[in-house]
Interface confidence: low
């Protein structure tokens, strides 16, 4: 069947379409294109005779048509007069004619479209603003777009006259956005450029910062107002009701109290004609002097004086705190506060009350501490002591002594020998010495600020020969597996060696044994009984040796075990009961007896004449030890069977 | 230059807990009273706690005793919040700031931290 296709079917204005002729018969005689439904000789556009190839033009040839020998129909340069339906008549060889129709519409090709607005500054949650989208043309569709998206759904947004117009009902300020309209139709699309919705809006409530409502007198007070607004906020300031300035921020330097009160600031937008304000409520403190420390006794003496520290200015109703060491006030008797904490007494200072001390005193702000504040305590001076700690000494040798004695201020000393001074100086030095420079050797220390003096005497022998040593012990009764002994070698000797003997042999190698301070002590760790031997130390230099007496070591043990004798527990009846009791321990433990539970008498042997059966029963000793304070027993069954039975078997067997 | 830098906040359910931290930089805490300061919209401003370390003094609203406590680690200048059966109505944008002991008056804020209580 003859059909005609348009190609395009939707053609722009200025465009051109071509009418394609599909199942053309055979054999023609030539054919015809008309302008409408129906063969119309008044509306003929071209004939075309197949066996001359000839076309001709008909009344509606309007010079912008070409026939194909196809039959197809190209229309060039289309206009809008074009749109609607074309007729092919199509004459066969045979004289029988044939029809077909197609159509094409005509669209314009769009122009840029623009938007138009009734109302270029609305006014927040007040005015309504309707765009336009200009031109008005015929056949086009209208879209719209805010921030390059679709359209959001909203009950505030309202589309009308053929979607030409976007109405947007009580404006907010989230509706400051770019908007474009679109134009459409089946041949062309085009957008505006964006429209950018200016809402006048505001001022809000203003915010004043910074937060600070608190300030100390002497400070820069800078308050700065923000009130969002469209267009920009114009802000004034009022102090206590009273304008101050026009001006975004309000800076005055060094306040004083008499800047306290209520800062007001206000926002104005000449658009809207709307104001708002805020309060905000400044409070400027006095600056409270710093605090200092006054002592009514600036050189206390220790264990005598007692210190009171008073932390000034005296202020009405205001807290007083107090520091040691940096740390806040220990619990202590010698410790005593005023009732308004602004005193301190120190009872009965010590060397270790120097401080530092500091008070502070409570604003309403923040706590001013004092600078710290040390006591002079004077003490001492303390017993001194003479280095170094030898006592005998070689002719010939130097003879250099020290003393030291804690002291505040420092000690003056001063050396005496054999009761005759010598020397005001802290060292004493003779040089050469001979057995005539031995004698009591005394330093004396003296504090001038507490007229107290201390002395310590050292005797100091000079000889060629050593004397016979001692041995000197820290424990005298240690106690087995529990305490530890040190034995030394007396006296401290220059030049000297230590040695050691035990039970006239040299020491053994032991972990429990060792050797310090140059071999002059020995320690032995965790006694036990058998380390109570006779302990002897020698001393010897390059001209003379010497040895000690024997030190017995008496280490107390025990109780052990005891055990009972004889070991029989069979008896018969009529027979006395000799028992015994024995347990090692230093010293010899005490012994008491329990028969069946009982206690019977204290003694190491329980005696009974003539037993019975009724003597039958469990036979216990007990030990104990004072001094080690330990305690150890045993249990024994004793049988006594009736004379004539066997031992050991029950009546009747 | 005075800084109160406050973290801990975030979205908790009904019951929990959480824990607020408030870093000051420029003063010692130890001569001051920090509090904890709580805004949400439509209440008014509340102090819910404060503690001044120097006299060991602490303070809560009766809306957070026995839930809420307040303590501060002078050693690292920080204070602490620690929040705990968290409800609904706790939900706010709590600033750490030092306090005036005698008087419910602020002097130098932080930037606040939000705390959401919701299931």
């Known amino acids: 069947k003859l059909t005609i296709e348009s190609t395009p079917f939707n053609v722009a204005e200025g465009k051109e379409v071509l009418l394609l002729v599909h199942n053309l018969p055979q054999h023609l005689f030539g054919y015809s294109w008309y302008k409408g439904e129906r063969v119309d000789g008044n509306r003929q556009i071209i004939g075309y005779v197949i066996g001359t190839q000839q076309a001709t033009p008909g009344p509606a040839y309007s010079g912008r048509e070409i026939i194909y020998p196809n039959a197809s129909l190209l229309i060039q340069n289309i206009i809008q007069n074009d749109t609607g339906f074309y007729t092919l008549h199509v004459i066969k060889s045979d004289l029988v004619n044939e029809e077909a129709t197609g159509q094409f519409r005509v669209y314009p090709e769009l122009p840029k479209p623009s938007i138009s607005s009734n109302n270029s500054k609305p006014v927040e949650d007040k005015d309504a603003v309707a765009f336009t989208c200009e031109p008005e043309t015929q056949d086009a569709t209208y879209l719209w777009w805010v921030n390059n998206q679709s359209l959001p759904v909203s009950p505030r947004l309202q589309l009308s006259n053929g979607n030409r117009t976007l109405t947007l009902f009580n404006v907010t300020r989230n509706d400051t956005a770019s908007y474009k309209c679109e134009t459409q139709n089946p041949v062309s699309a085009r957008r505006s450029d964006s429209v950018i919705l200016n809402v006048l809006y505001g001022p809000d409530a203003p915010t004043i910062s910074p937060l600070n409502t608190s300030y100390r007198s002497g400070e820069n007070l800078n308050l700065s107002c923000h009130a969002a607004s469209n267009p920009p906020a114009q802000y004034s300031w009022f102090v206590n009701g009273t304008f101050q300035q026009s001006t975004q921020e309000l800076f005055i330097p060094n306040i004083t109290v008499n800047n306290s009160g209520s800062y007001t600031c206000q926002a104005h937008n000449s658009d809207t004609g709307l104001n708002r304000t805020t309060v905000t409520t400044i409070t400027v403190y006095a600056e409270p002097p710093k605090p200092f420390i006054t002592s009514n006794n600036s050189n206390p003496v220790e264990d005598e004086d007692a210190v009171a520290l008073t932390c000034e200015p005296e202020i009405q109703n205001t807290t007083y705190l107090w520091w040691v060491n940096n740390q806040s006030l220990p619990v202590s008797p010698r410790l005593q506060l005023s009732n308004d904490n602004r005193t301190l007494t120190l009872l009965s200072v010590t060397r270790n009350d120097v401080g530092p001390y500091e008070c502070g005193i409570q604003n309403e702000l923040s706590v001013d501490h004092s600078d710290p504040v040390i006591l002079n305590v004077l003490y001492g001076p303390d017993d001194p002591t003479i280095s170094p700690s030898y006592t005998y000494y070689r002719p010939g040798v130097n003879l250099s002594l020290s003393c030291h004695a804690a002291s505040n201020p420092p000690a003056q000393y001063s050396w005496l020998i054999d009761g005759n001074i010598q020397q005001h100086t802290q060292e004493l030095f003779i040089s050469n010495i001979t057995e005539k420079n031995s004698g009591l050797y005394t330093c004396q220390a003296n504090n001038s600020a507490s007229g107290h003096s201390r002395t310590t005497v050292k005797t100091i022998t000079v000889s060629a020969e050593l004397p016979k040593p001692s041995i000197s012990s820290n424990n005298s009764k240690p106690v087995e597996d529990k305490d530890a002994v040190a034995f030394t070698c007396e006296p401290e000797a220059q030049n000297t060696t230590y040695l050691w003997w035990v039970n006239g042999q040299s020491l053994p190698v032991s972990p429990r044994l060792q050797l310090s301070n140059g071999n002059r002590t020995l320690t032995l760790f965790n006694v036990t009984r058998n380390d109570a031997r006779a302990y002897v130390c020698g001393i010897q230099n390059s001209v003379s040796a010497n040895r000690s007496d024997p030190v017995t070591l008496d280490v107390l043990y025990g109780p052990d075990t005891p055990i009972i004798s004889p070991p029989d527990s069979s008896y018969l009846s009529g027979a006395n009961l000799n028992l015994s009791c024995h347990s090692a321990s230093n010293p010899s433990p005490q012994y008491s007896w329990r028969i069946n539970g009982i206690p019977q008498q204290h003694t190491q042997v329980l005696f009974i004449a003539k037993i019975t059966p009724n003597n039958n029963g469990t036979y216990a000793c007990f030990v104990s030890n004072l001094a080690t304070g330990r305690n150890n027993s045993i249990v024994k069954s004793i049988t006594v069977s009736a004379s004539g039975t066997s031992p050991g078997l029950s009546a009747g067997a | 230059e005075v800084q109160l830098v406050e973290s801990g906040g975030g979205l908790v359910q009904p019951g929990g807990s959480l824990r607020l931290s408030c870093a000051a930089s420029?003063?010692?805490?130890?001569?001051?009273?920090i509090g904890w300061v709580r805004r949400a919209p439509g209440k008014e401003e509340e102090l819910v706690a404060a503690?001044?370390?120097?006299?060991?003094?602490?303070r809560y609203a009766d809306s957070v005793k026995g839930r809420f406590t307040i303590s501060a680690d002078t050693s690292k200048n920080t204070a602490y919040l620690q929040m705990n059966s968290l409800r609904a109505e706790d939900t706010a944008v709590y600033y750490c700031?030092?306090?005036?002991?005698?008087?419910?008056?602020?002097?130098?804020w932080g930037q606040g931290t939000t705390v959401t209580v919701s299931s």
């Open positions: 700031a030092t306090v005036a002991r005698k008087y419910n008056q602020y002097n130098y």
């Open positions: 420029g003063f010692n805490i130890k001569d001051t009273c």
């Open positions: 503690i001044c370390p120097y006299i060991g003094e602490t």
